[in-house]
Interface confidence: medium
């Protein structure tokens, strides 16, 4: 039970794609305003978004300090005129979020094949090794930075005449297929964390295809 | 199996300059940032400098004790990395390891033999 | 340039002992401390991430705590394969080993 002005957060979703990562909750507030702390199961609380008449927190910052930890998230409610009441325990109305592990659940964003080159009967397609919002020394670390061999790709490729797909894998960005010489052929690739349990696989990139200028080819 | 072989090293005189190499094979070399870490005579390890990947355009950052004197590269159509040193010290005699970075949580995770390198007169 | 000074240089102990070094940062490096641990003849292996994140397949008697300027690493209940030299590392801004610790057996 908290004050009679206000009520408390509900819905506390995790919104993370790519380590960018924002806590949302409801309700729209009316004569309220929220504040969100943000804590490993091991540490101290962190409050982030002071006095917000937002719904959502960017919780960014906090998360990718280490991804692998487990995160929990909290939303005060406090009156609006008056962010010192408290409910009737002595203590502002809050609601928990879920638990959160970056490492384990962030989405994987759409990835983007970066270039494709034929060599004869060969094609090497290069997949952009995305930046992600984790940074170390100055430098936005990428996807297989963070994730190293557990990132796969898997790519989907079939001539432009016809719907039959093949498909490849590979646990660098990069892929060496055989193709038929004077085909040409259509590329999308998937990043993939097998490992995984949830948010397996990301969306299919934008299909590329073989006459286009992202492409080289070399006899 | 990941692989990192150091050359290059020797006796060089005050002043003068040496260029290592380290051959880097079993992984995609691109996608890793690349270190250069050194260990003086009966001390401890210390930083040199490293490289970025191909994600970060392959910049580079020193600590302050060789900036200015040595630099790194990597020829990535031959898996190898290098660091330039000149304007040498004594100070600078130590074994240089080349070691692959994981930079999301600063582990050094392969590790070459290294090379030692001697500034004497 | 952010100094790491590392304490003490060396240390001899018991097996079944529990051994402490330290680490301090010359300015706030917030939790981004590693604890290496190297053996002759080997490349340094890294034990605990991020002050006291414990890296996959190391024992649970090593430790980390601390953050801002002062840290502990801790070996609870020291074993002989242990023996080591082991060091900080600084990862907040640039990279800055400790001096180390020569760990021994008594």
């Known amino acids: 039970s908290g004050t009679t002005n206000t009520v408390a957060a509900y819905n506390l979703t995790w919104k993370s794609t790519n380590f960018k990562t924002i806590l949302e909750w409801e309700p729209k507030p009316v004569n309220q305003v929220y504040t969100v702390q943000i804590s490993t199961k091991s540490g101290d609380w962190k409050s982030k978004c002071f006095y917000t008449t937002d719904t959502e927190c960017d919780l960014t910052d906090e998360i990718v300090k280490d991804v692998k930890q487990t995160y929990l998230a909290r939303v005060f409610s406090y009156p609006a005129g008056n962010v010192e009441s408290t409910g009737s325990a002595g203590e502002p109305l809050y609601e928990n979020s879920p638990e959160f592990t970056p490492y384990l659940e962030t989405n994987l964003g759409q990835p983007t094949i970066q270039s494709f080159e034929q060599v004869g009967t060969k094609v090497n397609v290069t997949v952009e090794d995305e930046r992600t919002l984790v940074r170390r020394n100055n430098t936005f670390l990428s996807l297989r930075d963070v994730f190293g061999k557990d990132l796969i790709y898997t790519l989907y490729y079939w001539k432009s005449s016809s719907s039959g797909k093949k498909t490849a894998k590979t646990n660098t960005n990069e892929f060496l297929i055989d193709v038929d010489k004077g085909e040409n052929y259509c590329f999308s690739v998937q990043a993939v964390i097998p490992s995984r349990t949830v948010n397996r696989k990301s969306t299919d990139s934008p299909v590329e295809c073989m006459g286009q200028e992202k492409g080289e080819f070399r006899e | 199996e990941v692989q990192l072989v150091e050359s290059g090293g020797g006796l060089v005189q005050p002043g003068g300059s040496l260029r290592l190499s380290c051959a880097a094979s079993?992984?995609?070399?691109?996608?890793?940032?690349m270190s250069w870490v050194r260990q003086a005579p009966g001390k401890g390890l210390e930083w040199v400098g490293f490289?970025?990947?191909?994600?970060?355009?392959?910049?580079?950052e020193y600590a302050a004790s060789v900036k200015g004197r040595f630099t790194i590269s990597r020829d990535n159509s031959k898996n190898s990395l290098y660091l330039q040193m000149n304007t040498l010290r004594t100070e600078d005699t130590a074994v240089y390891y080349c070691?692959?970075?994981?930079?999301?949580?600063?582990?050094?995770?392969?590790w070459g033999q290294g090379t030692l390198v001697t500034v004497s007169s | 340039a952010i100094q790491m000074t590392q304490s003490p240089s060396s240390l001899s102990a018991s097996v079944g002992e529990r051994v402490t070094i330290t680490c301090r940062a010359s300015?706030?490096?917030?939790?981004?401390l590693n604890w290496y641990q190297h053996k002759p003849g080997k490349g340094p292996k890294l034990l605990i991430y991020?002050?006291?994140t414990l890296q996959t397949g190391v024992p649970s008697r090593f430790s980390g705590s601390g953050s801002g300027t002062d840290f502990t690493f801790t070996v609870s209940n020291l074993q002989p394969e242990d023996i080591a030299t082991y060091y900080c590392?600084?990862?907040?801004?640039?990279?800055?080993f400790g001096q180390g610790t020569k760990l021994e057996i008594k």
């Open positions: 070691a692959r970075l994981t930079m999301v949580v600063a582990e050094f995770d392969y």
């Open positions: 079993g992984f995609t070399f691109t996608e890793y940032h």
């Open positions: 490289i970025r990947n191909r994600a970060n355009a392959y910049t580079t």
């Open positions: 300015q706030d490096i917030n939790k981004y």
């Open positions: 991020y002050t006291s």
């Open positions: 590392l600084q990862y907040d801004n640039l990279l800055t």
